[in-house]
């Protein structure tokens, strides 16, 4: 069964930004990525980027970059002020659209103790089961 | 609306060929994986298989490889399903259905169905 | 292939009552399980997705729930226009599956 891993970082330079890396292991072609945020897309997330391998990228505040980083990972930095500021405890949720495996999806926070600049490396990625 | 309207009944003889169509409307074919499933008279349903719209990939149920052929006219925003070598095993009523995207993998609009018979 | 297997093939009730359906999967589909109701006429809808999530215009009396490989829907306060045949869908792996189906008539 393919899995998604979500990765969410605090940058130490500005404390508002976030950072948030997924991955997808799985076999298939990815057709599509969501990220969301406040709980998964269609169940009470609300969407900050779509991904599309070919079509390209959209993004809505406070999503500033979204990125691809490999064929089957991506990156979105996150920053803002206000209503419209993410904190520390806020839910993102990355869903994959695979051929032919279908759509699979994760979510992830900051860790509790994330101070700035501390979180975890990048690699070895949690990996969060699709449930 | 979405809606997949699909084509009428047919009666084929043993050996032959048929070509049903799916048309969609109310949303971008190519935005959504298709399914089409099997349901012999009475019975449950089965996955033949999907197909991309987007780019033409399919994949197959090993059951229905060599039997069904998917493909899309992005044009005409219709998907089609051919069945080749049928027996009276094929007859059956066929769906198309939408893959919704969802986690869950679900299909969340279906057409109405297509009857094939196949007698001599 | 994952098999999906609904016990009861064909169950009656009273109009009002409470009624569960199950569903069992020959190993986990991880919440992966989707439910579909087919009216006498053939019509498909597809009513939970995600083992508990409802699909948008679907009435609040269906519910779903389970995990692993018992999964169960529940319709509250049966109606008329609820007749018809549940079938269960794991959406885990490739090829998906579905259960037999299981027929709910009135009583």
């Known amino acids: 069964t393919p899995e998604v891993w979500v990765q969410v970082r605090m940058e130490a330079t500005e404390l508002s930004s976030f950072t948030i890396r997924c991955g997808f292991l799985g076999s298939g072609s990815i057709s599509l990525v969501t990220v969301s945020w406040g709980g998964p897309n269609g169940a009470g997330g609300t969407t900050l980027a779509v991904l599309h391998p070919e079509r390209g990228i959209r993004q809505w505040a406070p999503a500033r970059q979204a990125r691809w980083e490999t064929q089957s990972s991506i990156s979105l930095i996150l920053e803002g002020s206000g209503a419209s500021s993410p904190c520390a405890n806020t839910t993102f949720c990355c869903k994959f659209a695979s051929f032919p495996e279908g759509s699979w999806e994760a979510c992830g926070s900051l860790p509790p103790s994330s101070d700035p600049g501390l979180s975890a490396p990048p690699t070895p990625a949690p990996i969060l089961r699709a449930d | 609306e979405v809606q997949l309207q699909q084509s009428g009944p047919v009666l084929v003889k043993p050996g032959a060929s048929v070509k049903m169509s799916c048309k969609a409307s109310g949303y971008r074919l190519t935005d959504y994986y298709m399914h089409w499933v099997k349901q012999s008279h009475g019975k449950s349903l089965e996955w033949i298989g999907i197909i991309n719209p987007y780019n033409g990939g399919t994949s197959y149920n090993q059951k229905f490889k060599g039997k069904a052929t998917l493909t899309v006219d992005k044009s005409s925003s219709t998907a089609y399903m051919e069945l080749n070598s049928l027996t009276s095993d094929d007859s059956a009523v066929y769906y198309c259905?939408?893959?919704?995207?969802?986690?869950?993998?679900?299909?969340?609009?279906w057409g109405q169905g297509t009857s094939v018979s196949v007698s001599s | 292939d994952i098999q999906m297997t609904q016990t009861t093939s064909s169950l009656s009730a009273s109009l009002g009552d409470r009624v569960t359906i199950s569903c069992r999967a020959s190993?986990?589909?991880?919440?992966?399980l989707n439910w579909y109701l087919q009216k006498p006429d053939g019509t498909v809808k597809l009513l939970i997705y995600y083992s508990s999530r409802l699909h948008s215009g679907v009435p609040s009396r269906f519910s779903g729930s389970g995990s692993g490989t018992d999964y169960s829907l529940t319709i509250n306060n049966l109606e008329q226009e609820d007749i018809a045949t549940y079938f269960c869908q794991q959406g885990n792996t490739l090829p998906r599956t579905f259960g037999g189906g299981t027929k709910l008539e009135i009583r």
């Open positions: 259905a939408r893959d919704s995207s969802n986690v869950g993998n679900d299909m969340d609009y």
């Open positions: 190993q986990d589909i991880s919440n992966y």
